[in-house]
């Protein structure tokens, strides 16, 4: 598993460094999660040919994975810090059920999958501290999430592999879009 943020070699080499700011902590946390996703994607791509598959759209229709759009205020055109922050937090909360699905989907990277899930929870907490308008954040309904999880786990093997691949790919993209927007704030 990657070294948790704040414990990398750069920090050791620079003991005089000021404590991390809120923005730096968020930035490091996202990069840490992206490291984890990278490791999980390696296992997924080695295990099956999903990463080269052209049948992605087929499976993608059944998933409602969060995606950044221009209306969310995270793009340069129409950038709105508060709207964007709400979108990032809401999106991460929506991803949590899919990250739960990823648990038990990996053999050699089981710890890594757990680390990605837990690190995302921490990231959400960091971002909630940064957000002013917490009332605008809608938390997914636990009952809906539970039935979605059951439905995903009941899929055949091919669809489960494809779902895993799509979740990782979409989560990576969402985090990258978030990282880019947060650096503009």
């Amino acid at each position: 598993a990657p070294v948790p943020p704040g414990e990398d070699s750069k920090d050791v080499a620079a003991p005089h460094r000021q404590p991390l700011t809120s923005s730096e902590r968020i930035d490091k946390q996202i990069r840490y999660i992206l490291d984890g996703i990278s490791a999980l994607r390696k296992e997924t791509c080695n295990k099956s040919n999903m990463c080269e598959s052209s049948k992605e759209a087929l499976a993608e229709n059944n998933l409602n994975l969060p995606k950044m759009a221009e209306k969310d205020g995270c793009f340069q055109s129409g950038f709105n810090e508060e709207t964007c922050l709400v979108k990032i937090i809401t999106g991460l909360l929506e991803f949590e059920v899919y990250l739960e699905y990823l648990q038990n989907r990996f053999e050699s990277s089981e710890e890594q999958a757990r680390a990605v899930q837990m690190s995302t929870k921490v990231l959400i907490q960091f971002l909630q501290k940064k957000a002013k308008n917490l009332d605008a954040i809608t938390t997914p309904d636990p009952t809906t999430n539970a039935s979605l999880l059951t439905k995903l786990q009941a899929q055949n093997q091919w669809l489960q592999d494809m779902t895993t691949h799509l979740i990782l790919r979409s989560f990576k993209e969402f985090l990258q879009s978030s990282l880019r927007a947060l650096r503009q704030m």
Partner: antibody, heavy 119, light 106 residues
């Protein structure tokens, strides 16, 4: 192998619009984390960043030139186009297109075109 | 906008020597800094990304370090092909900005 190549006029009259095309191969501009930017360099001077377009069509422009610049992409053709209106003799420079592609968005241009001199 | 300042603007050294050039950012950019090398008549080439990571294929005699507002690029055991201009780049946020460059003569 990743390659980029700029094309467009070498000579532009004052007040005219410059249209530059960056044709690339070896990567896709629909892959997350990938972007293409334009950078120019007047003779004997430093590099100046102009514009950038991401895989998801998010676009960024140099604030001092924003009103004159437009960047677009055609993913199917593997091309990025930069237009610059109201050209002036001070815009004489070598114009480069370059790729940025890494998981952590370090905004580093790892591959550059050969550049095209616009006078 | 984040301003990038490079020092010195030019320097001269012999083959085998070691040199260090510096780059300052007008505000903290964490480790989001890239270094490029440009030979006359050629396109720039990425040397170092994220302050200290060597780009694939770049010789280990190059070393980038620093964080927040102060960064350095050190070249040990200079080779004739190292001549040219070195640019640092703010890679933290848009607008991306380059330093004025350090011209190295071997």
């Amino acid at each position: 192998q990743v390659t980029l190549k700029e094309s467009g006029p070498t000579l532009v009259k004052p007040t005219q619009t410059l249209t530059l095309t960056c044709s690339f191969s070896g990567f896709s501009l629909s892959t997350s984390g990938v972007g293409v930017g334009w950078v120019r360099q007047p003779p004997g001077k430093a590099l100046e960043w102009l514009a950038f377009i991401w895989w998801d069509d998010d676009k960024y422009y140099s604030p001092s030139l924003e009103s004159r610049l437009t960047i677009t992409k055609d993913t199917s053709k593997n091309q990025v186009v930069l237009t610059m209106t109201n050209m002036d003799p001070v815009d004489t420079a070598t114009y480069y297109c370059a790729r940025s592609a890494d998981d952590y968005l370090y905004y580093s241009f790892d591959t550059w075109g050969q550049g095209t001199l616009v006078t | 906008d984040i301003q990038m300042t490079q020092s010195p603007s030019s320097l001269s050294a012999f083959v085998g020597d070691g040199v260090t050039m510096t780059c300052w950012a007008s505000q903290s950019i964490n480790d989001y800094l890239n270094w490029y090398h440009q030979r006359p008549g050629e396109a720039p080439e990425l040397l170092v990304f994220a302050a200290s990571n060597l780009q694939i294929g770049v010789p280990s005699r190059f070393r980038g370090s620093g964080s927040e507002t102060y960064f350095t690029l050190t070249i040990n055991s200079l080779q004739p092909e190292d001549s040219g201009t070195y640019f640092c780049q703010n890679a933290h946020s848009f607008p991306l900005t380059f330093g004025g460059g350090t011209k190295l003569e071997i």
